[in-house]
């Protein structure tokens, strides 16, 4: 999950596997102030998971979340 410093959440590691799409309810990008660019997926259990925005499955999920 993202590490919060001065209320700005940043990610220092990415999930290495696809999350079930049906378990994800929303997403947000971490701040440009963070050293690593990241997408944070929020699951239906309200867990926050850091993901690599360059991964194909991450881009696919973002597209489908934008359309829904």
């Amino acid at each position: 999950s993202p590490y919060s410093s001065d209320t700005t959440p940043c990610c220092f590691a990415y999930i290495a596997r696809p999350l079930p799409r049906a378990h994800i309810k929303e997403y947000f990008y971490t701040s440009g102030k963070c050293s690593n660019p990241a997408v944070v997926f929020v699951t239906r259990k309200n867990r926050q998971v850091c993901a690599n925005p360059e991964k194909k499955w991450v881009r696919e999920y973002i597209n489908s979340l934008e359309m829904s």
């Epitope: 999930i15 290495a16 596997r17 696809p18 999350l19 079930p20 799409r21 049906a22 378990h23 699951t43 259990k45 867990r47 998971v49 991964k55 194909k56 499955w57 696919e60 999920y61 489908s64």
Partner: antibody, heavy 119, light 108 residues
Framework: QVQLVQSGAEVKKPGASVKVSCKVS????????MHWVRQAPGKGLEWMGG????????IYAQKFQGRVTMTEDTSTDTAYMELSSLRSEDTAVYYC????????????WGQGTTVTVSS | SYVLTQPPSVSVAPGQTARITCGGN??????VHWYQQKPGQAPVLVVY???DRPSGIPERFSGSNSGNTATLTISRVEAGDEADYYC???????????FGGGTKLTVL
């Protein structure tokens, strides 16, 4: 080094259940996803389901929904796959597989457990 | 659900190049993994994320993914490469891992 060691071969009658175990060494069970894949004689690989640690949930392939249960005993670092209402088509080699190394792909596999369903 | 199509068999002479294809609708939008399985053994990951190679896998194994086809290429084929090869992707529409039907590589 991550290793998965599975339980021995089983022979079951139609309608019975089978429970296959997969003992993990070299890492903690909850760290990575654990999947189960089966292979009928002379056929291809078929994903049955798996545990998603970040989500804390197990997902099952539609085909096996309601008939398969995957559990984990974190105290012994052992994963289990139980398949009920067995029929002859369930005769197969059952593998556990995990993804500790390369981007979600199944990089470590158990040796396989042969399950034979015969009356 | 998502379908991956592989040729049932591919034959190649030793020292030649083998190409095993995996077809799927817009497969280039997905990360493809490849496994090698020898008789009586568990599968072994040989390529992940389209074209990356796990440590210990020879450089002769490479992968590509474009359009509707992913390809596993084995250059300078050896007798020991004879095996079944399976492609795999994550299908987010069903939240299922999907395997291709497998390709039997025969070294002549």
């Amino acid at each position: 080094q991550v290793q998965l060691v599975q339980s021995g071969a089983e022979v079951k009658k139609p309608g019975a259940s089978v429970k296959v175990s997969c003992k993990v060494s070299g890492y903690t069970l909850t760290e990575f996803a654990m999947h189960w894949v089966r292979q009928a004689p002379g056929k291809g690989l078929e994903w049955m389901g798996g545990f998603v640690p970040e989500d804390g949930e197990t997902i099952y392939a539609q085909k096996f929904q309601g008939r398969v249960t995957m559990t984990e005993d974190t105290s012994t670092d052992t994963a289990y796959m139980e398949l009920s209402s067995l029929r002859s088509e369930d005769t197969a080699v059952y593998y556990c597989a995990t993804d500790p190394l390369y981007e979600g792909s199944f990089s470590v596999w158990g040796q396989g457990t042969t399950v034979t369903v015969s009356s | 659900s998502y379908v991956l199509t592989q040729p049932p068999s591919v034959s190649v002479a030793p020292g030649q190049t083998a190409r095993i294809t995996c077809g799927g609708n817009n497969i280039e939008s997905k990360s493809v993994h490849w496994y090698q399985q020898k008789p009586g053994q568990a599968p072994v990951l040989v390529v992940y994320d389209d074209s990356d190679r796990p440590s210990g896998i020879p450089e002769r194994f490479s992968g590509s993914n474009s359009g509707n086809t992913a390809t596993l290429t084995i250059s300078r084929v050896e007798a020991g490469d004879e095996a079944d090869y399976y492609c795999q992707v994550w299908d987010s529409n069903t939240d299922h891992w999907v395997f291709g039907g497998g390709t039997k590589l025969t070294v002549l």
